[in-house]
């Protein structure tokens, strides 16, 4: 369960891949579009709102919490649309929804080296945003392995100037 | 409830090593990364790196990176910070540290051990 | 690396005072900032996370505020037991750093 229903913060910040590719977002035939790619030197960078939220640990859900707590994370790129898992499709899709946000919406935020992040997929632990040919994507990563693959690396540049409402 | 209990205090040569031991208790050992820090004394905290029990990786602090190894025993639910080529100014209370979330340092530190003071004396 | 700068390095004050404590980053670090009070011979103890975020436990006169680079403690009225230790970290990016410590001193 995801703790209370307001972030306990949030900030604004661009995406790129561990590779430095960057994450953009095009509204194409009324639907939006993810795109990883190289940006040209002057085009600006994509922003994305991140609102971090608190989430018991799943073995901890019913007992008193000891197991902790993780850190969530929902983007969204321009309002009200946010990144959601298509687990079937193993795809990443930009949806247009209304609070309370779907579990889809939610993504498990890892800390790793190099100053980068993960995204695990909160309804479906052990599946990661990643990158596959130039395109976000579902991808299954086994733990004890692999929680380094630069395919699920990114880097967030926060913009700190941040306001609530964006685009 | 959650306890991380440290090794008892040591005493040691410059040039040798210490290996300081944290057994965690009242948590899934693998649910969360384990940070090491330490605090000369009468002086601030210092940060050394992490490990992730589950996968084993480690980060080091790059003052520590020649010098430090971080591993785990998942089966005794321990993790271990081992500082080799000590010098005297290594003298310092260690700490282990759980963070208030599993996999990210953002919270900030929620449970600490209770310090292994190691004096490195000739 | 983040230097965190914590201001005053020393403070006296009365049992019943007010007392704000303030930490300035280096560089920009969002809302990842925590707030730690450490009592002689013992280890750090979780104040306040996420920059305002109260700790379960921690009592409601200890808050937070601030973002980007300036933060502040306040103790709303301090208490015997406050008069110790207290230190800020930067908990945005590796490598992770502390200020140098405010002690809070009877006056």
């Known amino acids: 369960s995801i703790t209370g229903i307001s972030p306990i913060t949030e900030s604004l910040a661009s995406l790129s891949t561990y590779n430095d590719q960057s994450i953009t977002f095009a509204l194409e035939d009324e639907s939006y579009e993810i795109y990883v790619e190289d940006l040209k030197k002057d085009k600006k960078k994509d922003k994305v709102l991140l609102s971090y939220y608190e989430s018991q640990h799943p073995s901890s859900e019913s007992g008193d919490g000891v197991d902790g707590k993780m850190l969530m994370v929902t983007l969204s790129p321009t309002k009200d649309f946010w990144l959601q898992a298509n687990n079937k499709e193993h795809s990443v899709e930009l949806h247009k929804c209304e609070k309370p946000l779907p579990d889809q919406a939610f993504f498990v935020l890892h800390n790793r080296s190099f100053n980068c992040v993960s995204f695990e997929c909160k309804t479906d632990p052990g599946v990661f945003i990643g990158v596959k040919d130039n395109h976000l994507a579902l991808i299954k990563v086994d733990y004890s392995e692999n929680l380094g693959s630069e395919n699920i690396l990114f880097k967030l540049s926060e913009i700190l100037e941040h306001h609530h409402h964006h685009h | 409830q959650v306890q991380l209990v440290q090794s008892g205090a040591e005493v040691k040569k410059p040039g040798a090593s210490v290996k300081v031991s944290c057994k965690a208790s009242?948590?899934?050992?693998?649910?969360?990364?384990m940070y090491w820090m330490r605090q000369a004394p009468g002086q601030g905290l210092e940060w050394m790196g992490w490990i992730n029990p589950n996968s084993g990786g480690t980060n080091y602090a790059q003052k520590f990176q020649d010098r430090v190894t971080m591993t785990r025993d998942t089966s005794i639910s321990t993790a271990y910070m081992e500082l080799s080529r000590l010098r005297s100014d290594d003298t310092a209370v260690y700490y282990c540290a759980r963070g208030r979330y599993g996999s990210s340092w953002y919270g900030g530190f929620e449970y600490w051990g209770q310090g292994t003071l190691v004096t490195v004396s000739s | 690396d983040i230097q965190m700068t914590q201001s005053p390095s020393s403070v006296s004050a009365s049992v019943g005072d007010r007392v704000t404590i303030t930490c300035r980053a280096s560089?920009?670090?969002?809302?990842?900032l925590a707030w730690y009070q450490q009592k002689p011979g013992k280890a750090p103890n979780l104040l306040i996370y996420?920059?305002?975020s109260l700790q379960s436990g921690v009592p409601s006169r200890f808050s937070g505020s601030g973002s980007g680079t300036d933060f502040t403690l306040t103790i709303s009225s301090l208490q015997p037991e406050d008069f110790t230790t207290y230190y800020c970290?930067?908990?945005?990016?590796?490598?992770?750093?502390f200020g140098g410590g405010t002690k809070v001193e009877i006056k």
């Open positions: 009242g948590y899934t050992f693998t649910g969360h990364y």
């Open positions: 560089q920009g670090i969002t809302s990842w």
């Open positions: 996420a920059a305002a």
């Open positions: 970290q930067q908990a945005y990016s590796l490598p992770l750093t």
